[in-house]
């Protein structure tokens, strides 16, 4: 089935859809490894045998991960590879989605209650203004199409609605600082703890220069995933979530609390 | 180990004004906050200001306001209280001392401030 | 403010002994599960020490014989058995909210 779909000359959202999830065999929202040497095989001989040529997005995306065993892109990269039909692209390729605090600021401005979800209304009212700021209008059932697969596509714990980190998977691969905090998240505990005791004046939320010592001891414990000559931009797109520069609890959890205790 | 060494004993006339150093070691200076006190004799211990060395951001204790002014400069991992207008009210011994969460955890030895005609 | 009463203002006490201190807040120092009370030992002459710190942490270092307890408004710090060199002046510290203040302080003597 993916691989007819790759044969295709423009692909719908639905088939970009069952694409992605062929290819992402362990559902970890990235194509990797032996992923990522699988697409681009069957990419090849899809486009031989339907005697179609390589686009050129196609032939630099070949160039670029076909002798590497270290790649990975996201739905983002994969979006802008394959001839995809050009309303559901431009979710991809908005503007501000461009950069990290850019995304953050549009993140905050739709989980409107603070809770850390952006729900399915949520999500259609972001969507639809996503294309609008495009200038492109769709119909509400095209619209209602896109959001469930919005959903579909980056909802990985299909709790019906989506985190910030799953909808972080919008932004190229190469912008997604929220990766490099990945692999330092801190049970609920920890985080509470540490949240409280860099609070320094107890007002109940961080602001600038408490962030910033909180970064610097971060980036001074976990030097193989963050680095320190970065804290500028990580400080920059995590205060991108705070209300008028007051960062608070369940914001910050957003990039340092897995959850749990 | 950390470590704050200040600046030795002060005798200034009213009016004057005056400079305090602390000179840190043994931490990362610049996610530190330093936190200045006052103590006159035989009494406890006031809390007059901090400053945030990773940007030169300060919080005073509103008493203090006008009275202290808080610097650092964090190519010599220095922090200083520069106090005005003295009055025989502000001599007192005046601690630096560092905080990195919500407690002072290393403090200097304190700079004796005379205010004498 | 929050204004910090200590007492007694001044304890002798006999080595081995216990020495209770108590530090009582105008309002609630306690939140989101911890409490902001710390306590510094002060001798003559030399700068203040930490010693227990968030109401019942012992600062490293710092022999077990000291203890602190409590929440909300009360707190205690322990000293058991007392030795020689226990003789100072001890001070309790909120950082709940600015201004932090502290105790007017309590004097130990060893008897």
């Known amino acids: 089935m993916a691989e007819s779909h790759l044969q295709s000359s423009l692909i719908t959202a639905s088939q970009f859809f069952e694409i992605w999830l062929h290819f992402d065999a362990d559902g970890s929202g990235y194509l990797e490894g032996k992923e990522l040497q699988n697409l681009i095989q069957e990419l090849l001989q899809a486009r031989k045998k339907a005697g179609l040529e390589l686009s050129p997005e196609m032939k630099s995306f070949v160039d670029q991960y076909g002798q590497r065993d270290d790649g990975k892109i996201g739905i983002v990269e994969l979006a802008h590879v394959l001839p995809t039909e050009e309303n559901f692209l431009l979710l991809f390729r908005c503007q501000q989605l461009k950069s990290c605090e850019e995304f953050m600021k549009t993140w905050r401005k739709y989980d409107t209650d603070h809770s850390g979800f952006i729900e399915t209304e949520e999500l259609k009212n972001f969507l639809k203004d996503l294309l609008e700021k495009a200038n492109k209008t769709v119909d509400d059932t095209k619209l209602a199409e896109y959001t469930d697969l919005m959903l579909k596509l980056f909802d990985s714990n299909n709790d019906g609605k989506l985190e910030l980190t799953e909808m972080a998977r919008l932004l190229p691969v190469q912008e997604n600082f929220l990766l490099k905090f990945q692999g330092i998240k801190m049970c609920g505990k920890e985080f509470n703890k540490a949240f409280e005791l860099y609070d320094q004046d107890g007002n109940g939320y961080i602001d600038e220069n408490e962030l910033d010592a909180l970064l610097k001891d971060l980036c001074e414990k976990n030097k193989q995933e963050l680095d320190i000559n970065n804290i500028t931009t990580y400080k920059k797109n995590i205060m991108a979530l705070s209300d008028g520069g007051k960062l608070y609890r369940t914001d910050l959890a957003l990039i340092l609390s897995a959850g749990d205790n | 180990q950390g470590q704050m060494q200040q600046s030795g004993a002060e005798l200034v006339k009213p009016g004057a004004s005056v400079k305090l150093s602390c000179k840190t070691s043994?931490?990362?200076?610049?996610?530190?906050?330093i936190s200045w006190l006052k103590q006159k004799p035989g009494q406890s211990l006031e809390w007059i200001a901090w400053i945030y060395a990773g940007t030169g951001d300060t919080n005073y204790n509103q008493k203090f306001t006008g009275k202290a002014q808080l610097t650092v400069d964090t190519s010599s991992s220095t922090a200083y209280m520069q106090f005005s207008s003295l009055t025989a009210e502000d001599s007192a011994i005046y601690y630096c001392?560092?905080?990195?969460?919500?407690?002072?955890?290393?403090w200097g030895q304190g700079t004796t401030l005379t205010v004498s005609s | 403010d929050i204004v910090l009463t200590q007492s007694p203002a001044s304890l002798p006490v006999s080595l081995g002994q216990r020495a209770t201190i108590s530090c009582r807040a105008s309002?609630?120092?306690?939140?989101?599960?911890?409490?902001?009370m710390h306590w510094y030992q002060h001798k003559p002459g030399q700068p203040p020490k930490l010693l227990i710190y968030?109401?019942?942490n012992l600062e490293s270092g710092v022999p077990a014989r000291f203890s602190g307890s409590g929440s909300g408004t009360d707190f205690t710090l322990n000293i058991h058995p007392v030795e020689e060199e226990d003789a100072a002046t001890y001070y309790c510290q909120h950082t709940r909210e600015l201004p932090w203040t502290f105790g007017g302080g309590t004097k130990l003597e060893i008897k």
């Open positions: 968030l109401a019942s």
């Open positions: 309002k609630s120092v306690s939140t989101s599960g911890y409490s902001y």
């Open positions: 001392a560092r905080h990195k969460y919500r407690y002072l955890d290393y």
């Open positions: 043994g931490f990362t200076f610049s996610s530190s906050y």
